[in-house]
Amino acid sequence: SHTLPVHFLQPSDIQKIVEELQSLSKMLLKDVKEDKGVLVSQNYTLPCLTPDAQPPNIIHSPAIRAYLKTIRQLDNKSVIDEIIEHLDKLIFQDAPETNISVPTDTHECKRFILTISQQFSECMDLALKSLTSGAQQATT
């Protein structure tokens, strides 16, 4: 599914992808939050920025994608496939697959989806902030 390895992407391309992911993450979270009475869980943590948070490896794309693919097994909200497709663009072809256990209890499924969706949305905000501040530093 990968057309170009990540290192062929320009920082401006990466920023465009992250901007799109930020927008999609907000849509996903908005829809997930329609399910009232579900609380965020402390049991799940989505990896976000890489230690150096520099393009092209600004975020832990393979791990994030693995979490979104797990959500996709549980839910077919329309934006999830698109999010996964965008994350694919930010992944090296030889990236190892992260294993995530799928919750089986109905309520725990909903908590997992809400928690990861919220963390993903926050992560995209951070990634975009990091990219834009890095771009400003590069021009000064």
Epitope: M27, L28, K30, D31, V32, E34, D35, R72, Q73, L74, D75, N76, K77, S78, V79, I80, D81, T106, C109, K110, I113
Partner: antibody
Framework: QSQLVESGGGLVQPGGSLRLSCAAS?????????ICWVRQAPGKGLEWIVC?????????YYAPWAKGRFTISKDNSKNTVYLQMNSLRAEDTAVYFC???????????????WGQGTLVTVSS | AFQLTQSPSSLSASVGDRVTITCQAS??????LAWYQQKPGKPPKLLIY???KLASGVPSRFSGSGSGTDYTLTISSLQPEDFATYYC??????????WGFGTGTKVTVL
């Protein structure tokens, strides 16, 4: 009591158009489910036509054969989903159902809801 | 194109018989599978969702199993009211698979 009610069926000539409506009552349009149109020709099986997502984006998925002639849309203020059918042919004669499906695999069967169907007859 | 292959297309059985209907997807649908019963002039009635969960009000003689691409509906002891047509359906959604129904299995009296 949640209900889906189809309307707009009837007799139409080949090449004609028809717009079917699927009105939701007992629940309001919000995220986390899809509304789909399914048809059943006399004595035949169920055939999926198209689905629309009820949420942030009105994403749509069409059966390959339905693209071009059939168009799904929704009006949140009226709690209604529509199916616009153009260039109708005799083989489009069928009972047209609308149905609601959960977007979550974990959800209870209350998310599976079908209307009673509306008959469309294409004949000269 | 994505396909759901249901078999057999028809079967004849007697009251008390154990009946098995299979549904095979052309690619994995992650248990996004429902089974319906339909009688003439009526909309389909949900029996099983998420491959194996019994819908409310459905007798326990109906059961579903399977994962990945292969799924089964079993009626442990056929009752007079069970003579009908049965359909499998995927509601996976998304652009890569879409939605769809099996071709149906008509269960008639032997």
């Amino acid at each position: 009591q949640s209900q889906l009610v189809e309307s707009g069926g009837g007799l139409v000539q080949p090449g004609g158009s028809l717009r079917l409506s699927c009105a939701a009552s007992g629940f309001s349009f919000s995220a986390n489910y899809w509304i789909c149109w399914v048809r059943q020709a006399p004595g035949k099986g169920l055939e999926w036509i198209v689905c629309i997502y009820i949420g942030s984006r009105a994403d749509t998925y069409y059966a390959p054969w339905a693209k071009g002639r059939f168009t799904i849309s929704k009006d949140n203020s009226k709690n209604t989903v529509y199916l616009q059918m153009n260039s109708l042919r005799a083989e489009d004669t069928a009972v047209y159902f609308c149905a609601r499906f959960s977007s979550g695999i974990y959800d209870l069967d209350r998310f599976f809801l079908w209307g009673q169907g509306t008959l469309v007859t294409v004949s000269s | 194109a994505f396909q759901l292959t249901q078999s057999p297309s028809s079967l004849s059985a007697s009251v008390g018989d154990r009946v098995t209907i299979t549904c095979q997807a052309s690619q994995s649908i992650d248990s996004w599978l429902a089974w319906y019963q339909q009688k003439p002039g009526k909309p389909p009635k949900l029996l099983i969702y998420q491959a194996s969960k019994l819908a409310s009000g459905v007798p326990s003689r109906f059961s579903g199993s399977g994962s990945g691409t292969d799924y089964t509906l079993t009626i442990s002891s056929l009752q007079p009211e069970d003579f009908a047509t049965y359909y499998c359906q995927t509601y996976y959604g998304g652009g890569h698979i879409g939605w769809g129904f099996g071709t149906g299995t008509k269960v008639t009296v032997l």
